[in-house]
C-alpha cells in the first residue's frame, strides 16, 4: 500500500475530540497537529483511543518535544502515560505533586510498573528528599513503596515524614531497612507519652536496639507476639527473662508456641533454665543450673 501522507480534505482536526477514534493511523498522523494535541491533552483521557492510535499520538508528542515533555503536558497525559517507556520518563522534569498524583492515578490498582518506578525516582531526586506530602502520596498508592527503597535511599527520609507511614507500609521491610527507619521514628515520636508512643513506634521496632527494648519493658506496653517475633535477634538476646516478661505482659504465654522459632529459640538458649521456669510456661533449652556462662565476645574485646 502506498504511504498516504496528505490529510484528506475536510479531515484536518480542529480540536481533540471523539471523531478522531474513527481516523486510521495514517489519518491521525497527517491530520492532527502536535501543538494542538499538546494544548488539549486533558481531553485524551475521556476518549477511547485504541493502542495503535495512542502510539500515533505519542509519536506526535515525541516529535514536538524531542528533549522531553514539559510538565504542562505531562500533567494531562492521562492513560497515554501507559505508553511511555522509562527512557521517555528520564527526560522529564516533574516537580509538581499534582502531576505525580495524576499519573499515579492512571496506574492505580496495578503493581508498580518500571514506568512508575522511574517517574517516582525522577520526582524524588528532583525534590532532594522524600518529604511528608510525597511519602503520603506514594504510600497511599503503593503501600509497599517504602520497603522497595534501599537503606541508602531511606536515609534521605526526614523524621517529619515518618508521621505519614502506616503499619502496613512496613510489612515487607527487611531488618536493614528498619535499622534506618527506626531512629527516625524514635525522633519523630519522641514527644508523645508512653502508650501513644508505643502505638506509633511499634511497627518500627524491628530496628530497635537492646537498650530501647529494655526501656520499653519498664513502661507496661504489653507488646504482642507478632511484634516480638519481628525484633532483631541480636537486640533480644541480652534481655533477661524478667525484662521479656514485662515487655510482653499478658502476651508472655505466647512464647511457648514460638519456642522453636527465632528470636525466641535463640533467646531461650541464652537464659538460665531456673529463670525460664519462673514463667511457668514449660520452656525448655535454657542453661542448666550450675553451669557458668562465659561471654566470649567480651573476652575477645578485652584481649
Amino acid at each position: 500500500e502506498v504511504e498516504k501522507t496528505a490529510c484528506p480534505s475536510g479531515k484536518k482536526a480542529r480540536e481533540i475530540d471523539e471523531s478522531l477514534i474513527f481516523y486510521k493511523k495514517w489519518e491521525l498522523e497527517a491530520c492532527v497537529d502536535a501543538a494542538l494535541l499538546a494544548t488539549q491533552m486533558d481531553r485524551v483521557n475521556a476518549i477511547p483511543f485504541t493502542y495503535e492510535q495512542l502510539d500515533v499520538l505519542k509519536h506526535k508528542l515525541d516529535e514536538l518535544y524531542p528533549q522531553g515533555y514539559p510538565e504542562s503536558v505531562i500533567q494531562h497525559l492521562g492513560y497515554l502515560f501507559l505508553k511511555m517507556s522509562p527512557e521517555d520518563i528520564r527526560k522529564w522534569n516533574v516537580t509538581s505533586l499534582e502531576t505525580l498524583k495524576a499519573l499515579l492515578e492512571v496506574n492505580k490498582g496495578h503493581e508498580m510498573s518500571p514506568q512508575v518506578a522511574t517517574l517516582i525516582d525522577r520526582f524524588v531526586k528532583g525534590r532532594g528528599q522524600l518529604d511528608k506530602d510525597t511519602l503520603d502520596t506514594l504510600t497511599a498508592f503503593y503501600p509497599g513503596y517504602l520497603c522497595s527503597l534501599s537503606p541508602e535511599e531511606l536515609s534521605s527520609v526526614p523524621p517529619s515524614s515518618i508521621w505519614a507511614v502506616r503499619p502496613q507500609d512496613l510489612d515487607t521491610c527487611d531488618p536493614r531497612q528498619l535499622d534506618v527507619l527506626y531512629p527516625k521514628a524514635r525522633l519523630a515520636f519522641q514527644n508523645m507519652n508512653g502508650s501513644e508512643y508505643f502505638v506509633k513506634i511499634q511497627s518500627f521496632l524491628g530496628g530497635a536496639p537492646t537498650e530501647d527494648l529494655k526501656a520499653l519493658s519498664q513502661q507496661n506496653v504489653s507488646m504482642d507476639l507478632a511484634t516480638f517475633m519481628k525484633l532483631r535477634t541480636d537486640a533480644v538476646l541480652p534481655l533477661t527473662v524478667a525484662e521479656v516478661q514485662k515487655l510482653l505482659g499478658p502476651h508472655v504465654e505466647g512464647l511457648k508456641a514460638e519456642e522453636r522459632h527465632r528470636p525466641v529459640r535463640d533467646w531461650i538458649l541464652r537464659q538460665r533454665q531456673d529463670d525460664l521456669d519462673t514463667l511457668g510456661l514449660g520452656l525448655q533449652g535454657g542453661i542448666p543450673n550450675g553451669y557458668l556462662v562465659l561471654d566470649l565476645s567480651m573476652q575477645e574485646a578485652l584481649s
Partner: nanobody, 112 residues
C-alpha cells in the same frame, strides 16, 4: 475502577438484527466518551459508533450509517448498539469502551 460487560452477541442470518448491551459499573460516566469498536478475524480494531455522555453527540463510521444505532440509558448505566440489516462482513468481536476502559467483547457472527 470502571468495569464494562458486553452482552447480546450471537449468530444471526444476513439481513437480521441484534441488540448489544454494555453495562458499566464502578464510576459515573459524565466525563467519558463511550464507543463501540469491532475486530474482525485477522483485522485491526475499528470504531463503529460513539456517544459523548455529556453532550449526547453521536458519530457513526461510514460503513454502518443508517443500519446501526448507538444509544444509552443513564438510569441503567448501559450503552446499546442496535444493529439492523446485518451483513457477513459485520462478523467480528464487538467491544464497548469508555475512556481508557474496555470490555472483554461479545462475538457477532452473520452467516446463513
Amino acid at each position: 475502577q470502571v468495569q464494562l460487560v458486553e452482552s447480546g452477541g450471537g449468530l444471526v442470518q444476513p439481513g437480521g438484527s441484534l441488540r448489544l448491551s454494555c453495562v458499566v459499573s464502578g464510576r459515573t460516566l459524565e466525563s467519558y466518551v463511550m464507543a463501540w469498536f469491532r475486530q474482525a478475524p485477522g483485522k485491526g480494531l475499528e470504531a463503529v459508533a460513539s456517544i459523548n455522555w455529556s453532550s449526547g453527540r453521536l458519530i457513526y463510521a461510514d460503513f454502518v450509517k443508517g443500519r446501526f444505532t448507538i444509544s444509552r440509558d443513564n438510569s441503567k448505566n448501559t450503552l446499546y448498539l442496535q444493529m439492523n440489516s446485518l451483513r457477513p462482513e459485520d462478523t467480528a468481536v464487538y467491544y464497548c469502551a469508555a475512556g481508557r476502559y474496555w470490555g472483554q467483547g461479545t462475538q457477532v457472527t452473520v452467516s446463513s
